[in-house]
Amino acid sequence: SASDYNSSELKTACRKHELYVSFQDLGWQDWIIAPKGYAANYCDGECSFPLNAHMNATNHAIVQTLVHLMNPEYVPKPCCAPTKLNAISVLYFDDNSNVILKKYRNMVVRACGCH
Amino acid sequence: SASDYNSSELKTACRKHELYVSFQDLGWQDWIIAPKGYAANYCDGECSFPLNAHMNATNHAIVQTLVHLMNPEYVPKPCCAPTKLNAISVLYFDDNSNVILKKYRNMVVRACGCH
């Protein structure tokens, strides 16, 4: 779209951003014993033409980027989303006040890409 | 940016949208013999709190949605991205004008989710 070519707006490309999440901030401190928080990270940034190799773009994202260039009113750009996620182990109280150690999948963003 | 939605809008939830892509529209008609185009589809829509089961949200997306609620200036909502992609077979001319049949992965969006 026209805004894609606005040189005065420096939009950063899709990448991983650091983010520490405190379970207290989420209001989960009463049931999560440990850890107190974790480095969750998040993905953000533009998936604009041309998509370079760092953007881990799928074939569909490459096609969608081209379609968006010509039809931005109808088709959005691909979005910047996690491509690799890691698990974390959490010690918590269950509903019966038992202490449980459980591995929660897909909690930490390790890499981002255009999807 | 100018392309952002107005806050007054009724935003639809993340879902798959139908999209037929013509290879001629992409300017690829000279090297792709068949098909003439394909149903690529795309993902679009909001990943807003609360994320319901239809949104195929990862654990990270659920956490990010909560963080966004508290810090919308700093952390974006998760984005609506493909969760299932299919391949298509394409008949095309290579650089030496040989006719090649190749399966291209991740070309068709089958399902979307909040990531």
Epitope: E73 | E9, T12
Partner: antibody, heavy 118, light 107 residues
């Protein structure tokens, strides 16, 4: 048949704002994008911006960024273009026009003359 | 931005003459070009889309050709009602840009 009817001519003072309306009929309003284009005297047509009438998404030409706002009312099948901080150089005919996916403009409004004069 | 250069800026021809208007794009736009006719005090009307496809309801004396950077609008036999301004529009990439127009008159 597809038709666009725009609001009447306006005379504005420098620094003022103008809001032009464009009522669509003859098709499903929310299925297509509406663009706004203007033509100043002796000048070529100039693209201003668009709105997706279905979801309200907009984009604007850099030449008007910050001064133009395009909106729509789906219950009234109407699109609006507001232009602020008017100068004499904004004296022009303003057109709404429909853009179908993958195509150029197929139908236009009759135009609205906006005159900026002190 | 893609620049659209249209020529001539004006022309005068006799009824029945073949008239040709050219649009040149500053970069390749494939076939993403439309031709429009605008009569005084009227809204533009699309004659040709996708560089060479005739809009429904438009007389067959109008035709379009070209691809890439060079495009032509031809009126095979000029009629009195064809007196108007004609312009091209590229819709390959935003911002969309227009030719400056060609004023067609009859002798």
């Amino acid at each position: 048949q597809v038709q666009f009817v725009q609001s009447g001519a306006e005379v504005k003072s420098p620094g003022a704002s103008v809001k032009v309306s464009c009522k669509a009929s003859g098709y499903t309003f929310t299925n297509h994008a509406i663009h706004w284009v203007r033509q100043a005297p002796g000048q070529r047509l100039e693209w201003m911006g668009w709105i997706n009438a279905g979801n309200g998404k907009t984009d604007y030409s850099q030449n008007f960024q910050g001064r133009v706002i395009i909106t729509r009312d789906t219950s009234a099948n109407t699109a609006y273009m507001s232009l602020s901080s008017l100068t004499s150089e904004d004296t022009a005919f303003y057109y709404c026009t429909r853009r179908v996916y993958g195509e150029s403009y197929d139908h236009w409004g009759q135009g609205t003359l906006v005159t900026v004069s002190s | 931005d893609i620049q659209m250069t249209q020529s001539p800026s004006s022309l005068s021809a006799s009824v029945g003459d073949r008239v040709t208007i050219t649009c040149r794009a500053s970069q390749g736009i494939r076939n993403n070009l439309g031709w429009y006719q605008q009569k005084p005090g009227k809204a533009p009307k699309r004659l040709i889309y996708a560089a060479s496809s005739l809009q429904s309801g438009v007389p067959s004396r109008f035709s379009g050709s070209g691809s890439g950077t060079e495009f032509t609008l031809t009126i095979s036999s000029l009629q009195p009602e064809d007196v108007a301004i004609y312009f091209c529009l590229q819709h390959q990439i935003y911002p969309w840009t227009f030719g400056q127009g060609t004023k067609v008159e009859t002798k």
